[in-house]
Amino acid sequence: MKVLQEPTCVSDYMSISTCEWKMGGPTNCSAELRLLYQLVFQSSETHTCVPENNGGVGCVCHLLMDDVVSMDNYTLDLWAGQQLLWKGSFKPSEHVKPRAPGNLTVHTNVSDTVLLTWSNPYPPDNYLYNDLTYAVNIWNENDLADSRIHNVTYLKPTLRIPASTLKSGISYRARVRAWAQHYNTTWSEWSPSTKWYNSYREPFEQR
């Protein structure tokens, strides 16, 4: 049994880190493999993660961590029974992938504006709460070429767009993702998308 692609890990900078890797052949990850992780300092407790399959040869493990802080560094040992397949280390604060924003809502009650709001995925006591910026993807359900990205570089999780910039009588979808500038993170996953119907009509005199 052999590792084809070594584990790479990302952290939500709160309590969960996710490691993914690929094996040399089809593997029942949960039955055959264990990922052990330990905080690098004195004789910290060793924790065990049971991986799940992620495609035929892929494995993924969700490591639960006790309140990730900037000083934390972990050793990682990938075992197949008594055989050590791979050994590495992981510093969560240097490999941050933010949690995805949630509760994306579209407000169309103001006639000429579409207001999108969503929730910051972090509590205010987490440094990332005030460090996130967002990208909002809006697309036409009937024409995937009619897609746009709005970068939201201010802190408030809202976006206002003129309804007139969207085609009338068309259903649109939106989704949002986040990244943190000070930590030079990767982008989060996209939020679940939300759908709305653009019923905006130009005023009569502009037709």
């Epitope: 900078y13 407790e45 802080v69 900037s70 560094n73 240097e94 006591d125 440094y127």
Partner: antibody, heavy 121, light 107 residues
Framework: QVQLQESGGGLVQPGGSLRLSCAAS????????LTWVRQAPGKGLEWVST????????LYADSVKDRFTISRDNAKNTLYLQMNSLKPEDTAVYYC??????????????WGQGTTVTVSS | DIQMTQSPSSLSASLGDRVTITCQAS??????LAWYQQKSGQAPKLLIY???RLQTGVPSRFSGSGSGTSFTLTISGLETEDLATYYC?????????FGQGTKLEIK
């Protein structure tokens, strides 16, 4: 506003024990890692111990490991430091400190006023 | 353990002077560095975190710079109330380690 109030310091003989407390208010106590830092007379600052928010992880300086125990009671909003087998070199002002953010555990935005521990025969 | 070496250990400067204190780490700590001010008989006070981010309420004459192994705390125009000892602290890895301190006196 955040308040941290240490107590429990005093004069103790070498080999003796003390239990320091730090009563906290003004923030969600259970969300933050908390730390003890000490300062010997006329000397610099020294990290002593940190306990993570949920209490499952405790970390110690080599100079106090196996003698000191950090703990917390999230219901009482109180941090503790049980100090056993005390040595003269443990003589210091002991501060409890709270970080600015829950995941920046060393950027201490709030400090108590300190409690003095003197180890002498 | 990461060693933090501060220099100078003490310095004397005049009001209005630009004052620079440096902190050298024994290995790279990225930008995981904080600066503290401690006045006589008081608890320390956070000035700078993340190497360069000014803590709320700290006068703008204080600034921090550097990354990797070399860091600087600058006071752009010294004032009487800045009489204190200044400490750097690395928050990159356990154990947390402070610099030995720089005692700032007013000429």
């Amino acid at each position: 506003q955040v308040q941290l109030q240490e107590s429990g310091g005093g004069l103790v003989q070498p080999g003796g024990s003390l239990r320091l407390s730090c009563a906290a208010s003004g923030f969600t106590f259970s969300s933050y890692s908390l730390t003890w830092v000490r300062q010997a007379p006329g000397k610099g600052l020294e990290w002593v111990s940190t306990i993570k928010a949920r209490g499952g992880t405790t970390l110690y300086a080599d100079s106090v490991k196996d003698r000191f125990t950090i703990s917390r009671d999230n219901a009482k909003n109180t941090l503790y430091l049980q100090m056993n087998s005390l040595k003269p070199e443990d003589t210091a002002v002991y501060y409890c400190a709270k970080p600015l953010y829950s995941n920046l555990a060393g950027d201490f935005g709030s400090w108590g006023q300190g409690t003095t521990v003197t180890v002498s025969s | 353990d990461i060693q933090m070496t501060q220099s100078p250990s003490s310095l004397s400067a005049s009001l209005g002077d630009r004052v620079t204190i440096t902190c050298q780490a024994s290995q790279s700590i990225s930008s995981y560095l904080a600066w503290y001010q401690q006045k006589s008989g008081q608890a320390p006070k956070l000035l700078i975190y993340g190497g360069s981010r000014l803590q709320t309420g700290v006068p703008s004459r204080f600034s921090g710079s550097g990354s990797g192994t070399s860091f600087t705390l600058t006071i752009s125009g010294l004032e009487t109330e800045d009489l204190a000892t200044y400490y750097c602290l690395q928050v990159y890895s356990w154990p947390l380690t402070f610099g030995q301190g720089t005692k700032l006196e007013i000429k």
